[in-house]
């Protein structure tokens, strides 16, 4: 899987979208998990409603929400009040039994709030060195690695 980078501003909300084939994943619940290193396990953060037909209902775990448009084939995750510690590698998953298919790998980057000068020294600004090389801009808040590109293995 390529990794898509989503950038959000500290203190604001960030929406992550994960498109998928609605027919292929028909009847499957979805989940959002946080990966502990690029080769590490993925820890479940939040999953869609236990009843697949109610997947459109937003479910929260702390400041993270998930909702699934099962007809359109888009899983949406909202990270509210984004903080530096929310930065990291995540996965959108499609669940079947005890197995999970990866729909998308996501790197969340937290940018400084340009209006908050008090904490400006504590957060990353766009334009600084990036974790992934040669990534192209997909749209305003996300970008994908080029086909075949391998992200740096990150540091602990």
């Amino acid at each position: 899987h390529n990794t898509t980078v989503f950038q959000g501003v500290a203190g604001q909300s960030l929406q992550v979208s994960c498109p998928y084939d609605s027919m292929k994943h028909w009847g499957r619940r979805k989940a959002w998990c946080r990966q502990l290193g690029e080769k590490g396990p993925c820890q479940r953060v939040v999953s869609t409603h236990n009843l697949w037909l109610l997947s459109f209902l937003r479910r929260w775990n702390g400041s993270t929400a998930i909702t699934d448009d099962t007809l359109g084939g888009t899983l949406t995750i909202t990270l509210r009040n984004l903080q530096p510690h929310d930065a990291g590698l995540y996965q959108c998953q499609s669940l079947h039994g005890s197995e999970a298919d990866t729909l998308r790998k996501v790197l969340v980057e937290v940018l400084a709030d340009p209006l908050d000068h008090r904490d400006a020294g504590d957060l990353w600004f766009p334009g600084e060195s990036e974790s992934f090389e040669d990534a192209h801009v997909e749209h305003s808040i996300s970008r994908s690695l080029l086909e075949g590109e391998i992200p740096f293995p990150p540091t602990s």
Epitope: G37, E38, H85, L89, F125, S129, S131, T155
Partner: antibody, heavy 120, light 107 residues
Framework: QVQLVQSGAEVKKPGASVKVSCKAS????????IHWVRQAPGQGLEWMGW????????KYAPKFQGRATITADTSTSTAYMELSSLRSEDTAVYYC?????????????WGQGTLVTVSS | DIQMTQSPSSLSASVGDRVTITCHAS??????LSWYQQKPGKAPKLLIY???NLHTGVPSRFSGSGSGTDFTLTISSLQPEDFATYYC?????????FGQGTKVEIK
């Protein structure tokens, strides 16, 4: 028991090459990234490079590019670091280090270190 | 390369003291900072990852904080086994780089 066991101490002459091995037990090296870090006597830690044993991809610190070669043999769960054109300032303890990569790896294993002495 | 600067380079403290070591990055590194402890003749040991997360088995007297460019390792009550050298390491970009180390000695 999870551990990384490195090869023994080496004494080399300037201009020679040295190859240090790092054998993993208790886990599969392809599930990890293997890094090499060195430490000259009385000095700090210096990252040299890494390999992804799963596909053989490697990356080096600019200082070691072209002089260090990191390889891995998944069949024996062993990683290697070869350093060529040795000079006296390469005298150091060389460590291998396994982790799950960037972005919050909770796994962190180190070899016991291999002392490489370069002396004429 | 990203430069990591630790301070102080050495300090003397007594058992029970609160000790603070700082690490400054030359560029923003988000929260991608680890702290290691190293004792003479031994390999480094991970204490803190992702700036503030305590590694498994590490005593709770160790804590880390910071994001962006400035980070802190705190030992709330120094114990005899804590006398060692401490290194910060950035993991925002490659090459990974370490601070020069802070040696914590017995006063």
């Amino acid at each position: 028991q999870v551990q990384l066991v490195q090869s023994g101490a080496e004494v080399k002459k300037p201009g020679a090459s040295v190859k240090v091995s790092c054998k993993a037990s208790g886990f599969s090296i392809e599930d990890f990234y293997i890094h090499w870090v060195r430490q000259a006597p009385g000095q700090g830690l210096e990252w040299m490079g890494w390999i992804d044993p799963e596909n053989g991809d490697s990356k080096y610190a600019p200082k070691f590019q072209g002089r260090a070669t990191i390889t891995a043999d998944t069949s024996t769960s062993t990683a290697y670091m070869e350093l060529s054109s040795l000079r006296s300032e390469d005298t150091a303890v060389y460590y291998c280090h396994a982790d799950h990569g960037n972005y919050g790896s909770t796994m962190d294993y180190w070899g016991q270190g291999t002392l490489v002495t370069v002396s004429s | 390369d990203i430069q990591m600067t630790q301070s102080p380079s050495s300090l003397s403290a007594s058992v029970g003291d609160r000790v603070t070591i700082t690490c400054h990055a030359s560029q923003h590194i988000n929260v991608w900072l680890s702290w290691y402890q190293q004792k003479p003749g031994k390999a480094p040991k991970l204490l803190i990852y992702k700036a503030s997360n305590l590694h498994t088995g590490v005593p709770s007297r160790f804590s880390g904080s910071g994001s962006g460019t400035d980070f802190t390792l705190t030992i709330s009550s120094l114990q005899p086994e804590d006398f060692a050298t401490y290194y910060c390491q950035q993991g925002q970009t490659y090459p990974r780089t370490f601070g020069q180390g802070t040696k914590v000695e017995i006063k």
